[in-house]
Amino acid sequence: MMTGTIETTGNISAEKGGSIILQCHLSSTTAQVTQVNWEQQDQLLAICNADLGWHISPSFKDRVAPGPGLGLTLQSLTVNDTGEYFCIYHTYPDGTYTGRIFLEVLESSVAEHGARFQIP
């Protein structure tokens, strides 16, 4: 039975050219996290494997940095980065947990940044 829940940064906004941290946190389960996949509209951004470490997709290598923790940092944001991002936690023995974050990249310098949520 899957008892865990995923907390995410929720809906966030950031300025064009800036950077943002995408963060998820799995709680209320003792399941072992074996791998976390970060995806944007079915495009793989990165994988963090518990044993083998990080893999960043080559097409995002210049603009995506691993961490903090199991999170992902997006840099040099463009308006095309606006959209849904998913953290997919693969766990044993529970299975898969998915969190959703919506990022809006604004042209204006008055973009309000969502709270930067850190893993405790």
Epitope: Q35, N37, D42, L44, I47, N49, L52, H55, H90
Partner: antibody, heavy 123, light 107 residues
């Protein structure tokens, strides 16, 4: 050309351990992760785990955790798979297989395979 | 882990005919799927990666399609050397997992 040459067939008693070797040639050994797959007689393919020959980092399938150990010797371009506490169900052909992509574990289908090593567990 | 299910288990086809093999994933693997061919007493041989891209040296009669959870391997005109067992494999989540295989036999 890429070649993966495995050690010869083994016959082991239940409870014993077996260590299978896989010698790589024809490419830069430390640039490609190596996976291990087994196949019981008349059965399908079963993923066991993977090793990064550069760093020695490993990832094992949950089923084999605690019983399998994958190591490498960069001086001889050889990877090893040791399976302990053998039981009759471990009777299978064991294959090493190279992950296609250079320098990572993704996207990594298995492009070159060893010839296989038959391990028989019998009392 | 992701469960890969292949169907049918056995496919009886006459030489020159088309063979269609199916593979289903228990959750989306996007296009992270490979196909392998195995003949008796031999190691598997890599045919397809990325669900639809043929590996080097693989004849054009082999084609792969699909994305997400449903995949197909098609052999357009079976040659005698194509009678073998075919396996699909996902490589997006560890442990990587294989389907149970489809045996293509001569009708």
């Amino acid at each position: 050309q890429v070649q993966l040459v495995q050690s010869g067939a083994e016959v082991k008693k239940p409870g014993a351990s077996v260590k299978v070797s896989c010698k790589a040639s024809g490419y830069t050994f430390t640039s490609h992760y190596m996976g291990w797959v087994r196949q019981a007689p008349g059965q399908g393919l079963e993923w066991m785990g993977v090793i990064n020959p550069s760093m020695g980092a490993t990832s094992y399938a949950q089923k084999f955790q605690g019983r399998v150990t994958m190591t490498r010797d960069t001086s001889t371009s050889t990877v090893y798979m040791e399976l302990s506490s053998l039981r009759s169900e471990d009777t299978a052909v064991y294959y090493c297989a190279r992950l296609h992509v250079s320098g990572s574990y993704y996207p990594a289908y298995l492009d070159y395979w060893g010839q296989g090593t038959m391990v028989t567990v019998s009392s | 882990e992701i469960v890969m299910t292949q169907s049918p288990a056995t496919l009886s086809v006459s030489p020159g005919e088309r063979a269609t093999l199916s593979c289903r994933a228990s959750q989306s693997v996007s296009s992270n799927l490979a196909w392998y061919q195995q003949k008796p007493g031999q190691a598997p041989r890599h045919l397809i990666y990325g669900a639809s891209t043929r590996a080097t040296g693989i004849p054009a009669r082999f084609s792969g399609s699909g994305s997400g959870t449903e995949f197909t391997l098609t052999i357009s005109s079976l040659q005698s050397e194509d009678f073998a067992v075919y396996y699909c494999q996902q490589y997006i989540v560890f442990p990587w997992t294989f389907g149970g295989g489809t045996k293509v036999e001569i009708k």
